[in-house]
């Protein structure tokens, strides 16, 4: 019936052409370059928080949109005027022609134009909505920017105050360090003064010692003189006694000279009828040399020679080789009988060794070795033990086979360290081994976690320092 065509002319304006019979109607409509067509998809700018668009750019875009709006409005007005003008012209033509069918065409054209106008209006409404959306988005972005800016400003203020605090603290510490340096210098000076004073004191003491040594020499000389006098007196007394006994013998021949009895060990003392605990004088085997020892005449049948006792920490056991050789301490209290005597004694016949132990909780235990002897001094009084029984552990806390004896001045252990110096006291150290009954004496509540205490590992562990210990020997055939 009719042909309606839409095309673009060479200058980019939209061209509407209506063909009806022999008549052709062409309408040229102005096209706005800045107006986005409804068919093209709208792509919004994805805005992320804290990554704002430039404020000036947003303002510029708003201005562009306002211009577009204004242009569109003008264009609508022009369109309306254009349509009205055309309508007037068409009406005059219609009236002049007075042709019925042309009226219908004009009505149709009018309808088309109205439809187009409606479509344009709808497009404009869309554009307006888009502009509003964009404006809202921009406002939100601006709000976000301002919030972000406030947040940053707050953070900067916080950091600034923190920096100020740190600076204050730093200056305070600097002052403190300077004060400490001053104090340190003063202390160093006082230490130096003390050192000088001590050196003076030491030199004074040295001179006093020298004087004392001279006095000792003099005293020794005097002592020798006194000893000679005493010897002479004794000889005189003996002569007198001899004379008296001779004269008495002449008068009473029944009086015999009293025999001097000597005992090798406490077993012999016991067998001679002395069954009371106490200190007795013993004689070295094959010698006239004497030694005082404590004899236990009650425990386990009696006859025990006590060779070591610890009970109260009253005696220092960090002694020299010579002191351990000859013995030290008090036989009625803490003491060491002496390695030389024990070595000579235990090499004469078979001896048993009993070690009696007490802890701080009231418990007692013992280790009994059915064979015991000490080697000679040439072999560093090496201990030899066999046949372990008792309640203080099924494994011997004195390393087997026995080790050499070590003291602070005689290092014979199997350690690159010096066990005697490290653990204190003389003992048959291994490297350094599971026992040391001659270690430091620690009182109750200070006796745990002590590596250098009185130790018997296979009864109480490595860090426990015992309350009391007794080492005693007796012939195996007693």
């Amino acid at each position: 019936y009719n042909n309606f065509r839409k095309s673009m002319d060479s200058i980019g304006k939209k061209q509407y052409q209506v063909q009806h019979g022999s008549c052709s109607y062409t309408f040229l409509l102005p096209e706005m370059d800045n107006c986005r067509s409804s068919s093209s998809p709208y792509v919004s700018n994805a805005v992320q928080r804290d990554a704002p668009l430039e404020y000036d750019d947003s303002v510029q875009r708003l201005q562009v949109l306002e211009n577009i709006m204004e242009n569109n409005t003008q264009w609508l007005m022009k369109l309306e005027n254009y349509i009205q003008d055309n309508m007037k012209k068409e009406m005059v033509e219609i009236q002049q022609n007075a042709v019925q069918n042309q009226t219908a065409v004009m009505i149709e054209i009018g309808t088309n134009l109205l439809n187009q106008t409606a479509e344009q209006t709808r497009k404009l409404t869309d554009v307006e909505a888009q502009v509003l959306n964009q404006t809202t988005r921009l406002e939100l972005q601006l709000l976000e920017h301002s919030l972000s800016t406030n947040k940053l400003e707050k953070q900067i203020l916080d950091q600034t105050s923190e920096i100020n605090k740190l600076q204050d603290k730093n200056s305070f510490l600097e002052k403190k360090v300077l004060a400490m340096e001053d104090k340190h210098i003063i202390q160093l000076q006082s230490i130096k003064e003390e050192k000088d004073q001590l050196q003076v004191l030491v030199s004074k003491q040295n001179s006093i010692i020298e004087e004392l040594e001279k006095k000792i020499v003099t005293a020794t000389v005097n002592n020798s003189v006194l000893q000679k006098q005493q010897h002479d007196l004794m000889e005189t007394v003996n002569n007198l006694l001899t004379m008296m006994s001779t004269s008495n013998s002449a008068k009473d021949p029944t009086v015999a000279k009293e025999e001097q009895i000597s005992f090798r060990d406490c077993a012999e003392v016991f067998k001679s009828g002395h069954t009371t605990n106490g200190i007795y004088t013993l004689t070295f085997p094959n010698s006239t040399e004497e030694i005082k020892a404590y004899c236990d005449m009650e425990a386990g049948g009696g006859g025990w020679t006590i060779i070591q006792r610890r009970e109260d920490g009253s005696v220092d056991f960090q002694r020299t080789w010579k002191e351990y050789k000859v013995g030290f301490g008090n036989p009625s209290g803490e003491y060491w009988l002496g390695n030389e005597f024990v070595s000579q004694l235990t090499n004469q016949q078979r001896y048993v060794l009993k070690i009696h132990l007490k802890d701080w909780e009231g418990n007692e235990a013992y280790s009994l070795y059915e064979h015991f002897y000490l080697s000679s001094e040439e072999l560093n009084y090496r201990i030899h033990l066999k046949g372990l029984t008792g309640t203080a552990g099924k494994i011997s806390s004195i390393s087997q086979p026995g080790n050499d004896f070590s003291t602070k001045d005689g290092d014979n252990d199997k350690c690159i360290c010096k066990c005697s110096q490290m653990l204190t006291g003389g003992w048959w150290f291994d490297a350094c081994g599971p026992s040391n009954l001659n270690g430091m004496y620690y009182p109750q509540r200070q006796n745990t976690n002590k590596f250098n205490g009185i130790k018997w590992y296979y009864w109480k562990g490595s860090g426990y320092s015992l309350k009391a210990t007794t080492m005693m020997i007796r012939p195996a055939d007693f």
Epitope: Y373, L379, H384, K386, G387, L388, S396
Partner: antibody, heavy 112, light 107 residues
Framework: VQLQESGPGLVKPSQSLSLTCTVT???????YAWNWIRQFPGNKLEWM?????????SYNPSLKSRISITRDTSKNQFFLQLNSVTPEDTATYYC??????HYVSSMDYWGQ | SIVMTQTPKLLLVSAGDRVTITCKAS??????VAWYQQKPGQSPKLLIY???NRYTGVPDRFTGSGYGTDFTFAISTVQAEDLAIYFC?????????FGGGTKLEIK
């Protein structure tokens, strides 16, 4: 420490077996006990006796009547004499040092 | 005298195996028990003394334990060179006595 046995390989029944053990690297008078042990065919081991560093001796009761262990300290040697031997005494004879001087003990050094 | 009963008499093992030998004393021997190794044509060598003490230079694959009458000797990982006869010995009372021996053979 080294120990070396020496003596005749064959002894006629009823005669005496005499063996020597020469010790090098340690003085037999210093410490320890110096033993004689024998091993019968079938690998059974028997301790015979020792002489201690001090010169005291100890013997296996099963041999007591016919065994004697002596020493020569100047040569650092000790000796075994077993009298009235029989074919039952056929064995490998070892000398050895024990770790205890006055009593029987484990033996840490053996002859060849 | 104390009789030492050693078991087993023979052990057939492969290299890498763990082996255990036991010795039972007829009366208490305290901890005075030693273990020896005798390789073919050689004299016995001390491995363990006082029941559990490893002798100088003895590899730690050899271990001993026990007290009183029951004693155990073990080789954790048998090696070819461990082919030998192993003896236990008590020296708690005189005369010292030996076990009958355990022959260790490698498959």
């Amino acid at each position: 420490v080294q120990l070396q046995e020496s003596g005749p390989g064959l002894v006629k029944p009823s005669q005496s077996l005499s063996l020597t053990c020469t010790v090098t690297g340690y003085s037999i008078t210093s410490d320890y006990a110096w033993n004689w042990i024998r091993q019968f065919p079938g690998n059974k081991l028997e301790w015979m006796g020792y002489i201690s560093y001090s010169g005291s001796t100890s013997y296996n009761p099963s041999l007591k009547s016919r065994i004697s262990i002596t020493r020569d300290t100047s040569k650092n040697q000790f000796f075994l004499q077993l009298n009235s031997v029989t074919p039952e005494d056929t064995a490998t004879y070892y000398c050895a040092r024990s770790t205890f001087g006055h009593y029987v003990s484990s033996m840490d050094y053996w002859g060849q | 005298s104390i009789v030492m009963t050693q078991t087993p008499k023979l052990l057939l093992v492969s290299a890498g195996d763990r082996v255990t030998i036991t010795c039972k004393a007829s009366q208490s021997a305290s901890n005075d028990v030693a273990w020896y190794q005798q390789k073919p044509g050689q004299s016995p060598k001390l491995l363990i003394y006082y029941a559990s003490n490893r002798y100088t230079g003895v590899p730690d694959r050899f271990t001993g334990s026990g007290y009183g009458t029951d004693f155990t000797f073990a080789i954790s990982t048998v090696q070819a060179e461990d082919l030998a006869i192993y003896f236990c010995q008590q020296d708690y009372s005189s005369p010292p006595t030996f076990g009958g021996g355990t022959k260790l053979e490698i498959k």
